[in-house]
């Protein structure tokens, strides 16, 4: 008996798609061996049509795929644009076609519905609109027009020209009689329900000379589109419901048990708590289409999703819908990275962001998720040297450590920095990840003075006190600018006196600026790192003023003033800030990046669109 299992019989109609799931024992050998789908010949051979090693027969080109799900021991064969020629006996299997690890599948493709004995067939999707056209002769032009539905043996009146409407159709049906030139009336039914399907008869006149026309209405449930995404990655659901619902509330819901569909997000402002911080509903286009982006995919996100339109913002009978079956691949290419990073007020965090290592030259971005309305994610910093004005001097995006990870450092933390942030690039949109920054009780580990004033032409020494917990770390000073933080020479001044209960391993490391010039004004950071991995940082603003008295300045912690609240930007920086993002590929699918910058604060365009692994802000 073969351990492979699947459907013995598959039936479909021409033009449709099938999705055949084959199950295998998920041993490590089975998980990684070749998977195939082959057609059995009359003489017993089995000709491969598609395999997991990339082979696709010319018969299947552009209309089939095979996806392996090693973690649950299944592979799925999708075949689209079926024709009657596809009917036959197949095998799905593992290894080599001629060996026994396979399962026999019979596929039967029948002819699609057509015109039957003068019956016009209308095939319409659930929730959409159908127009049933009913011709009549001149002698019946002034007579009653009506539409009946065949229920069992009896025709039941649905609507007529005297104003009757069957209660099942109230508010969603009308009868239109064309102008005198056209001998035609039509019945328009909106918000089609599954129960509307069936045989209809339209009639003009009531006597033996009446004109009759049969109609067969087929209401289709949407075939769910299969979507396969990696754990920790991102998925985008594009929902195009048509211009007729452009002004109706939109929703995305996830089917739970049975008929229930729990709202994930809708345009009325509802959002499921499980998706807080990791979902965006993009503003809709004029044609009513919209998209929903979900990042930080979890195992429990797998399931069936429906998008639709209804004034209630949730699934109701007659809602036009689109469906997806989301599979979350646990053997993910996206590496684990902390989903929660903690920092203290006044301290800092260093966030590691994964990206597709094949796209090392892509532009990297970091944005702050905002939950208001449908969610948005205004950009804060990018790898091309742009930083949002309010974050000047305390935010930096570094390409290190590279090879699939970049680093974002944020310091001078306040409680307002708590929230969800997204890491993303202008390349692979599946690699958007989410991190939550939490501000916890505690003191910053690094101690530096507040704002410092240097005197032109003199020497300035700025101290940074490192506690003993960082004894094994590399300590550095750097000057912040919008492209990063350029390392500067610093001096180890021996043990620090700034820490109670801290031994000789604490350190005082000073930055010395000789012969200060105007160019030395700006933000300076001291910090710790291990190789290319960054830890805590602390920021000091150095102002430069005219000489008042000779000598050098040595700043101590006691002399420190509070850091300035605001800085006036120089014109060059403001120009960079107000420059529109030129790269058209960035979030092209969400149409999110446009020159919609708020000129007042220089804010960048925004991406409109758990059980946490935690990382402290102070170490790695």
């Amino acid at each position: 008996k073969s351990p492979i299992f699947g459907p013995e019989e598959v039936n479909s109609v021409e033009g449709n798609s099938v999705s055949i799931t084959c199950y295998y024992p998920p041993t490590s050998v089975n998980r990684h061996t070749r998977k195939y789908w082959c057609r059995q010949g009359a003489r017993g051979g089995c000709i491969t049509l598609i395999s997991s090693e990339g082979y696709v027969s010319s018969k299947y080109a552009g209309r089939a795929n095979l996806t392996n799900f090693p973690e649950n021991g299944t592979f799925v064969v999708n075949i689209a644009q079926l024709s009657q020629d596809d009917s036959g006996r197949y095998k799905c299997g593992l290894g080599i076609n001629s060996r026994g690890l396979s399962f026999d599948v019979s596929l039967e493709v029948s002819q699609g519905p057509g015109l039957l004995n003068d019956t016009k067939v209308y095939t319409v999707d659930l929730g959409r609109t159908v127009t049933i056209n009913c011709p009549f002769k001149t002698e019946n032009a002034q007579k009653r027009k009506s539409l009946y539905k065949q229920i069992g043996l009896y025709p039941v009146l649905v609507i007529d020209s005297s104003g009757y409407v069957n209660p099942n159709y109230t508010g969603r049906i009308r009868l239109d009689i064309q102008g005198t030139g056209q001998l035609l009336f039509s019945v328009v039914i909106n918000q089609l329900r599954l129960s509307d399907a069936g045989q209809y008869l339209c009639q003009a006149g009531d006597d033996s000379n009446s004109n009759k026309k049969n109609a067969d209405l087929q209401v289709l449930k949407p075939e769910p589109e299969l979507v396969y995404e990696d754990l920790r990655g991102s998925v985008t659901f594009h929902c195009a419901l048509g211009p007729e619902v452009a002004n109706v509330a939109k929703f995305l819901c996830r089917q739970s048990s049975g008929e229930n569909c729990d709202v994930v997000v809708n345009t009325l402002g509802k959002r499921a708590p499980a998706f807080e911080g990791r979902i965006l509903l993009n503003p809709q286009d004029k044609d009513g289409s919209f998209s929903v982006v979900i990042t930080g995919l979890r195992k429990e996100d797998a399931g069936r999703y429906l998008c639709g339109a209804h004034s209630d913002g949730q699934l109701q009978e007659g809602s036009p819908i689109q469906a997806w079956q989301l599979f979350v691949n646990e053997e993910s290419t996206i590496p684990r990275s902390p989903t929660v990073v903690k920092g203290v007020a006044g301290g800092s965090v260093a966030v590691l962001c994964p990206y597709n290592r094949k796209e090392s030259k892509s532009i990297k971005y970091w944005c702050l998720w905002e939950g208001a309305q449908n969610g948005r994610c205004p950009l804060l910093v990018d790898s091309e040297g742009w930083v949002k004005a309010q974050y000047e001097g305390r935010l930096s995006l570094l390409e290190e450590p590279g090879n699939g990870t970049f680093t974002v450092i944020l310091n001078q933390l306040t409680s307002r920095d708590a929230g969800f942030y997204w890491c993303l690039t202008n390349g692979d949109t599946l690699w958007r990840t989410t991190v939550e920054i939490k501000i916890i009780e505690g003191e910053p580990n690094l101690k530096v003075p507040g704002n410092v004033t240097a005197v032109l032409g003199e020497t300035l020494k700025v101290p940074c006190h490192f506690p003993c917990k960082f004894s094994s770390y590399e300590k550095y000073w750097c000057k912040w600018n919008n492209t990063g933080c350029q390392a500067l020479p610093s001096q180890d001044e021996g043990p620090s006196k700034a820490f109670v209960n801290c031994d000789e391993n604490s350190r005082l490391v000073s930055l010395t600026l000789n012969l200060v010039t105007r160019a030395d004004e700006g933000w300076y950071w001291c910090g710790v790192k291990q190789g290319h991995f960054y830890g805590e940082t602390a920021a000091v603003y150095v102002a430069v003023e005219e000489r008042k008295a000779a000598g050098s300045r040595d700043v101590s912690l006691a002399k420190a003033d509070a850091a300035p609240d605001e800085k006036v930007l120089d014109s060059g920086f403001r120009e960079i800030e107000n420059k529109a993002i030129q790269d058209p590929r960035l979030f092209a699918e969400e149409k999110a990046v446009a020159d919609t910058r708020d000129q007042a604060d220089g804010s960048r365009a925004s991406v409109d669109s758990g059980s946490s692994e935690e990382q402290g802000g102070s170490s790695r």
Partner: nanobody, 126 residues
Amino acid sequence: EVQLVESGGGLVQAGGSLRLSCAASGRTFGSYSMGWFRQAPGKEREFVGAISWSGSSTYKYYEDSVKGRFTISRDNAKNTVPLQMNSLKPEDTGVYFCGGTMERRDPRRTSAYDYWGQGTLVTVSS
């Protein structure tokens, strides 16, 4: 909420036939899967067959021991899933349950189903 009700069970001689039916009521959207399982006294519930559908496509699954003897189908008009059982054997005796789910899961597993009927007893005498 979805309710499932099985019917058609009874006593039959070996070699005979029975037609069970699983009627579903309640609202459903999108695809659906219905599975037939049986449970002999003192034994675990075991898979017999299943049918799932999505749009105009239907998929039928059978346990090896019933292949060629049992046929699962779907009656759209009545919203039922009949199980036609021919050439019945004494080892086919048990309570037959139908289960329903809207998820795409392994149809052989009882854990794949969200809804269950109360069961109908089939006794095959020798």
